[in-house]
């Protein structure tokens, strides 16, 4: 039985041109995390495998940095980065858990400051 839950940063906003950390956390399970996949809609951004390390999709390699931890740092944000992001936790023996983050990229003067995990 899958007992775990994914905690995410939820809905976040960031400034155009800035950076943001996408973070998820798996709790309430003793399952071993073997891999975390980061996806935007139907596009893979990155994979962090516990043993093999990181894979960064070539289309994002100039704007995505691994970490911190199992998270992902998205840089040089554009308005086109607005949308849903998914962290997909592959675990043993539980299986797969998915978390959702909604990112809104705003023009500099409009963006909220102080969103959780936001990089100034």
């Amino acid at each position: 039985m899958m007992t775990g839950t994914i905690e995410t940063t939820g809905n976040i906003s960031a400034e155009k041109g800035g950076s943001i950390i996408l973070q998820c956390h798996l709790s309430s399970t003793t399952a071993q995390v073997t891999q975390v996949n980061w996806e935007q809609q139907d596009q893979l951004l990155a994979i962090c495998n516990a043993d093999l390390g990181w894979h960064i999709s070539p289309s994002f390699k100039d704007r995505v940095a691994p970490g911190p931890g199992l998270g992902l740092t998205l840089q040089s944000l554009t308005v086109n980065d607005t949308g849903e992001y998914f962290c997909i936790y592959h675990t043993y023996p539980d299986g797969t858990y998915t978390g959702r983050i909604f990112l809104e990229v705003l023009e500099s003067s409009v963006a909220e400051h102080g969103a959780r995990f936001q990089i100034p």
Epitope: L44, D51, L52
Partner: antibody, heavy 119, light 107 residues
């Protein structure tokens, strides 16, 4: 020039073990994962597992159920794959391959090592 | 485990032909797909990754596309040196798995 040079062909008895080596050169060994892939005669490719020399992480394909062990000697930039409890179905060409940096794609391959299991 | 099903398993074509090979994943693999070329008695060679980026030195006649579960490798104008077996592979989740291969033969 990146090179992966594997050890020579082996003939083994059923029930025994084989250890294949893969010597890497032309790049920094600790910066790239080494994978092992095998190919039975006339068959397709089968991923066996990988070794990350950066933090000694090892991952295996569970179909081998503990029969495979992947190690490395960083001082000589050499990776090893040992397969135990050999059976005739393990007769295959065994390849080591390097993963590209920050990419799960195997960009350079060894020449292959033929392992024949026969009584 | 994710199954990768390639079709056709073999095909005959002539030099200059446009060749299309398909690969279908048994479940979503996003764009985590790689294509390799293998000639008899030789190790596989990386062709295409992620799934539309050509590896260094790969001619522009090779192209890849797809996302989700359906992927395609296209050779726009087949050359004599392209007669080989082609494999797709997914790295969306472990164990990494390969398609059964497509052998491209001379007609």
């Amino acid at each position: 020039e990146v090179q992966l040079v594997q050890s020579g062909a082996e003939v083994k008895k059923p029930g025994s073990s084989v250890k294949v080596s893969c010597k890497a050169s032309g790049y920094t060994f600790t910066e790239h994962v080494i994978h092992w892939v095998r190919q039975a005669p006339g068959q397709g490719l089968e991923w066996m597992g990988g070794f990350n020399p950066n933090h000694d992480g090892t991952i295996y394909n569970q179909i081998f159920r503990g029969r495979v062990t992947i190690t490395a000697d960083k001082s000589t930039s050499t990776a090893y794959m040992e397969l135990s409890s050999l059976r005739s179905e393990d007769t295959a060409v065994y390849y080591c391959a390097r993963a590209a940096k920050l990419l799960f794609a195997m960009d350079y391959w060894g020449q292959g090592t033929t392992v024949t299991v026969s009584s | 485990d994710i199954q990768m099903t390639q079709s056709p398993s073999s095909l005959s074509a002539s030099v200059g032909d446009r060749v299309t090979i398909t690969c279908k994943a048994s479940q979503h693999v996003s764009n985590a797909v790689v294509w390799y070329q293998q000639k008899p008695g030789k190790a596989p060679k990386l062709l295409i990754y992620s799934p539309s980026y050509r590896f260094t030195g790969v001619p522009s006649r090779f192209s890849g596309s797809g996302s989700g579960t359906d992927f395609t490798l296209t050779i726009s104008s087949l050359q004599p040196e392209d007669f080989a077996t082609y494999y797709c592979q997914q790295h969306y989740s472990t164990p990494w798995t390969f398609g059964g291969g497509t052998k491209v033969e001379i007609k």
